[in-house]
């Protein structure tokens, strides 16, 4: 069967987000992938979206991320814009209203996005073959 257009959009967004790092992609998020053995695919997507939402809600106005110049501000706005897009598309793919995120493990946002990209690429390779 054909791959969902949303999945392609997610991979595209993740490709962009992982092209470069910023000060704030080095901040930590809940690592939902550390122990996701008994989690359904939809739950994983829902929990990933929840983690991203928590991150940008918490850091959108974080002065460490916003920086001191117009260019640094633009960079942070870019990060938040792409994370919101990713969040929106992940919710669409998950089709769930809410999901718990209780893990204690942490990873950097950068590593979280890389791991998510790997998962999404694997899903894409299965649905496109």
């Amino acid at each position: 069967h054909k791959c969902d257009i949303t999945l392609q959009e997610i991979i595209k967004t993740l490709n962009s987000l992982t092209e470069q790092k910023t000060l704030c992609t080095e901040l930590t998020v809940t690592d939902i992938f550390a122990a996701s053995k008994n989690t359904t695919e939809k739950e994983t997507f829902c929990r990933a979206a929840t983690v991203l939402r928590q991150f940008y809600s918490h850091h959108e106005k974080d002065t460490r991320c916003l920086g001191a110049t117009a260019q640094q501000f633009h960079r942070h706005k870019q990060l938040i814009r792409f994370l919101k897009r990713l969040d929106r598309n992940l919710w669409g793919l998950a089709g769930l209203n809410s999901c718990p995120v209780k893990e204690a493990n942490q990873s950097t946002l950068e590593n979280f996005l890389e791991r998510l990209k790997t998962i999404m690429r694997e899903k894409y390779s299965k649905c496109s073959s």
């Epitope: 962009s16 092209e19 470069q20 790092k21 910023t22 110049t69 260019q71 640094q72 633009h74 990060l79």
Partner: antibody, heavy 118, light 107 residues
Framework: EVQLVESGGGLVQPGGSLRLSCAAS????????MHWVRQAPGKGLEWVVW????????TYADSVKGRFTISLDNSKNTAYLQMNSLRAEDTAVYYC???????????WGQGTLVTVSS | DIQMTQSPSSLSASVGDRVTITCKAS??????AAWYQQKPGKAPKLLIY???HRYTGVPSRFSGSGSGTDFTLTISSLQPEDFATYYC?????????FGQGTKVEIK
Amino acid sequence: EVQLVESGGGLVQPGGSLRLSCAASGYTFTDYSMHWVRQAPGKGLEWVVWINTETGEPTYADSVKGRFTISLDNSKNTAYLQMNSLRAEDTAVYYCARGGIFYGMDYWGQGTLVTVSS
Amino acid sequence: DIQMTQSPSSLSASVGDRVTITCKASQSVINDAAWYQQKPGKAPKLLIYYTSHRYTGVPSRFSGSGSGTDFTLTISSLQPEDFATYYCQQDYTSPWTFGQGTKVEIK
């Protein structure tokens, strides 16, 4: 594959005008900012202008402020550089370059030569 | 405007040499410095961004370091394809400014 292709360069007299185009492909145009950078013959790189393609907000170098105008046609994935009141010192190869998602300029066009001479 | 001063302006080196190029900003740019490589008749290529992060596909022999006002590009073992001109650039604030370039020539 990301590609930037400039066009519109040529020979123009001092005081004249020229419009350069930068056609982008292989990515979502409004996701990345766009720059124009120039290089006079045998010289180094000089940044000219930057535009936020999402908002259309430009920022110019002092050397071109009031003379050069950057604009976008998002339907054509193209950035334009309108250059008026050209001077001999504007003679250079003009490159358009995509702003990296956060830093630097990660993709560059091949450049187009602008010669201002009488 | 922030001035970026590169040194040396040119250097001669042999294949296998370790090459270091420095860039000094006229005021702090925190970590917002990038390095580009340009070959004659070609467009520049992004090598390093955010002081020390190699751009996609850039060989590991290229590394960047520094912070504040002093930045360094190091080529650990010069290869034939590395003979080119290198530019530093700050993107801390507009106007974005470049160093004057360092030409790396064959000894």
